[in-house]
Interface confidence: low
């Protein structure tokens, strides 16, 4: 190989060992029979050399640095050439470095030809191995602006006082152009300006200077985004740290088209704006840091650009001004994410503050819109607390547990509407009365409606799930001892049509000791399946539940248990079941941890089934499934 550098070129070439490898055989640069591992070629020199091995690219790298002095004379602006031409260089991993020094008053602009640049962060690399590393200067300090690959959105980077640009090309890459030009501009009065141009839908991830290390103290950095008129942009912060400020405050400022309050100032921890039409600027402003404990300011953010959907031009009013203790959350439903570009799915408050999820609270009217390619990607969860603090005031008071009609006007599916029903301990209990009698969901008779009510204890220490219930059964009411949550969960979009079937009334009633009482009036046409709360996990220790089963005058009820034995093993106490005729008060007691369960039995009158648990041994819990069928009486036995 021969490398000759003109005297006035201001270019130096350095060939040196790259990252050490575990190759057994060493390799040397051979210059007139002298072996060396480093070669430096300065302007005006011409050197002939070769390598002592067949694959020097596994051992050596080459750096070509050109110093461009804009302080003492005119600056060579325009397209930057690769000099010496790559065809004249040995096939090593090459880094071309351009070091441009200029006055503080002069702005320098790097312009990148298509394909533009894409910034990447720590631990990432470029698919083709071609990387651009760009640094600026603040006085004598070098500041890393960022490292970039091809195929992105970054079209221009403006700096002042100087630029150091490094283009890294793998040894096998055929590239022979730099892909950028330099132009002079007036002073930009900040560290740098990065212009990012979107041609269509897509996203860009960008980082503050020096990322992941700290952004220079009290500096200003600006990103300018060029967005096609028919698209919308949203900003989300992926990662940030704040330093310890002594004076001023770290912030981001936006110049947003059409905003009457430009610049719009946000803290880094705020929700960042979304659903923006047209070009906009984002600036990061540092502060004067505490000298003793500066901390670091760093920011990594994403700009997502996508088509506005029909829905995003609509404003929806969610009126929670008359609600109390209510929160409504719109959020993504859980899905596996595909690897291709997935448009963002945002919900926006006042059309500007957009995020992947949004929680609205009671006491206000909220205006929301959507920026989402497919609204089925979102769902809605609502929580409402109904609490009674004074038992004298609440007793016999009733509340309707009904999904407000406002919610049906929103274009996203309701997933859960949860009512937390809270009562004063040991003073009051609750009764749930459905508009339509309920069926308990069991494997034997699953619910097939578009929604169910999930009833569970709302006492943090108590793991008690009464079950899932849907309209169209035989349960007339459910009485519970203390705090519960009732969740209306939807399973199909047809819930909107079936909404009229929903409706539960809760009333506060005098306190009783049993965990739950189910009032059941079986239907003559079908089996009623009933099972103990906490199915599959076992009725909690020392818990008691009852079923009040009504038998019409002209019918006989057959009570059948699913298993011969419960399988419960008591560690302490006894588990028992009482079956009591309501008319005669005659009762039978069965020891569930010792006796077999009764064979199918007939009841001519209404009766109680009461189950009380012991403290079971682990893995030997109490789960009981039984069913009731009605048949017409053939003989009047009264």
């Amino acid at each position: 190989f021969e490398i000759a550098l003109p005297r006035e070129s201001n270019i130096t070439v350095l060939i040196k060992l790259g990252t050490p490898t575990l190759l057994a055989k060493p390799c040397y640069i051979v210059i007139s029979k002298r072996h060396t591992t480093m070669l430096s070629i300065k302007p005006g020199e011409r050197i002939l050399f070769t390598f002592s091995c067949q694959s020097p690219e596994n051992h050596f790298v080459i750096e070509i640095q050109k110093n461009i002095d804009c302080m003492s004379g005119p600056c060579p602006f325009g397209e930057v050439q690769l000099q010496p031409s790559t065809s004249l260089l040995p096939t090593l991993n090459r880094t071309f470095i351009w070091d441009v020094k200029a006055h503080k008053s002069i702005g320098l602009e790097l312009q990148f030809s298509i394909p533009r640049l894409r910034q990447f962060g720590p631990g990432e690399s470029c698919p083709d191995g071609v990387t651009y590393s760009i640094s600026g200067r603040i006085d004598a300090t070098v500041v890393r602006i960022g490292t970039f690959c091809s195929n992105g959105t970054v079209s221009r980077i403006k700096m002042q006082e100087g630029v150091k640009m490094a283009l890294h090309l793998p040894w096998f890459h055929p590239r022979n152009v730099s892909g950028f030009s330099i132009a002079n501009r007036s002073s930009i009065k900040r560290l740098c300006i990065i212009e990012s141009v979107f041609e269509g839908e897509g996203s860009a991830t960008l980082m503050s200077a020096n990322y992941p290390e700290g952004f220079p103290e009290d500096e200003l950095m600006t990103w300018q985004f060029v967005i096609p008129a028919h698209l919308r942009a949203s900003v989300s912060f992926l990662n940030f740290n704040l330093s310890n400020c002594e004076r001023k405050e770290e912030r981001v400022e936006y110049y947003i088209p059409g905003s009457t309050t430009n610049p719009e100032v946000f803290k880094l921890e705020d929700k960042q704006p979304g659903n923006m039409a047209g070009n906009f600027n984002l600036s990061l402003q540092g502060c004067d840091q505490d000298a003793q404990n500066p901390g670091i300011l760093r920011l990594q953010f994403q700009v997502l650009v996508q088509h506005p959907q029909n829905e995003s031009n609509k404003i929806y009013v969610v009126d929670l001004s008359n609600e109390r203790a209510t929160s409504l959350t719109i959020e993504p439903r859980p899905v596996k994410q595909s690897r291709k570009f997935v448009p963002g799915c945002f919900v926006c408050l006042e059309s500007r503050t957009c995020s992947t999820n949004l929680t609205l609270t009671s006491g206000s009217k909220h205006k929301i819109s959507f920026l989402c390619d497919n609204l089925t990607r979102l769902w809605m969860n609502v929580e409402k607390n109904i609490s009674c603090t004074d038992h004298r005031y609440c007793q016999r008071k009733s509340y309707s547990l009904q999904v407000p009609s406002d919610i049906f006007h929103l274009p996203v599916e309701l997933h859960d509407f949860s009512w937390k029903l809270l009562v004063p301990k040991d003073r009051l209990s609750l009764v749930l009365v459905p508009a339509q009698k309920l069926q308990q969901h069991t494997h034997e008779k699953p619910c097939n409606t578009s929604f169910s009510y999930l009833v569970a204890s709302a006492i943090p220490s108590q793991d008690l799930y009464f079950g899932s219930f849907c309209p169209g059964g035989s349960i007339e009411q459910i009485q519970v001892k203390q705090n519960i949550s009732v969740t209306l969960r939807t399973f199909a979009p047809s819930f909107r049509q079936e909404a009229s079937r929903q409706g539960l009334t809760v009333s506060f009633i005098p306190y009783f000791k049993e965990e739950g009482v189910f009032t059941v009036t079986p239907d003559t046409k079908s089996k009623v399946y009933l099972r103990t709360p906490n199915w599959d996990r076992g009725l909690p220790s020392l818990t008691s539940v009852s079923w009040n089963i009504s038998v019409p005058r002209d019918q006989v009820a057959c009570l059948t248990f699913f298993k011969e034995r419960t399988g419960v093993v008591c560690q302490t106490g006894r588990a028992f079941m009482i079956i009591q005729e309501q008319r005669t008060r005659a009762e039978e007691i069965f020891s569930l941890d010792e006796d077999a369960l009764p064979k199918p039995r007939f009841h001519h009158h209404s009766f109680w089934v009461n189950i009380s648990n012991c403290s079971p041994a682990s893995g030997k819990q109490l789960d009981l499934l039984f069913w009731v069928t009605l048949t017409p009486r053939t003989v009047d036995l009264t």
Partner: antibody, heavy 119, light 107 residues
């Protein structure tokens, strides 16, 4: 308070499958990523991968691609690790831990689930 | 992937002595390094995040330092409950890796 409660120990035969659960409470599951870490008997910690709890998208370390599946059921605030075609060398304690999606540090850990694979 | 090498493998000290544990990364990882303590039969516990940031609830005798590829965990005066295994963890890029651990044992 924040808690990650894992399912109990499992004894499995080679070739079988196992599913370990990790129930999160005291915080909103979707606000933090969930990571899984393996510790073979007497050995150090190995990061297996993480699941984005907002999207359900899993990311696996190279050694854990194929037989290992991370999943989520946000309705019960639970993350799962499923291992299929179990081998003796899968015998280990498996931990779930809460992290941040970026630069994670694991501030809360489950109590660990011992999976023993033996014929 | 980033390889973390901890030294020494075992450190034998008496209560009251100063402990210095080292963790070296195979490449620069800035300050993306965290330290954990694990006692027998227990889950790991986060001690230090981002090389030097303290964690609430962790005694002040634990401190961290370093940046780039060399990191140190220091226990200013070892208490009896500090005898355990200590791991460093890189969170610089996937896959996140742990060091092989340093066992701090009673002399």
């Amino acid at each position: 308070q924040v808690q990650l409660v894992q399912s109990g120990s499992e004894l499995k035969k080679p070739g079988a499958s196992v599913k370990v659960s990790c129930k999160a409470s005291g915080y909103t599951l979707t606000d933090f990523s969930m990571h899984w870490v393996r510790q073979a008997p007497g050995q150090g910690l190995e990061w297996m991968g993480w699941i984005n709890t907002e999207t359900g998208a899993p990311t696996y370390a190279d050694d854990f691609k194929g037989r290992f599946v991370l999943s989520l059921d946000t309705s019960v605030s639970t993350a799962y690790l499923q291992i299929s075609s179990l081998k003796a060398e899968d015998t280990a304690v498996y931990y779930c831990s809460r992290g941040r999606d970026y630069d994670p540090h694991f501030d809360y850990w489950g109590q660990g689930t011992l999976v023993t694979v033996s014929s | 992937e980033i390889v973390l090498t901890q030294s020494p493998a075992t450190l034998s000290l008496s209560p009251g002595e100063r402990a210095t544990l080292s963790c070296r990364a195979s490449q620069s990882i800035s300050d993306f390094l965290h330290w954990y303590q694990q006692k027998p039969g227990q889950s790991p516990r986060l001690l230090i995040k981002y090389a030097s940031q303290s964690i609430s609830g962790i005694p002040a005798r634990f401190s961290g330092s370093g940046s780039g590829s060399d990191f140190t965990l220091t226990i200013s005066s070892v208490e009896p409950e500090d005898f355990a295994v200590y791991y460093c963890q890189s969170a610089h890029s996937f896959p996140y890796t742990f060091g092989q651990g340093t066992k701090l044992e009673i002399k």
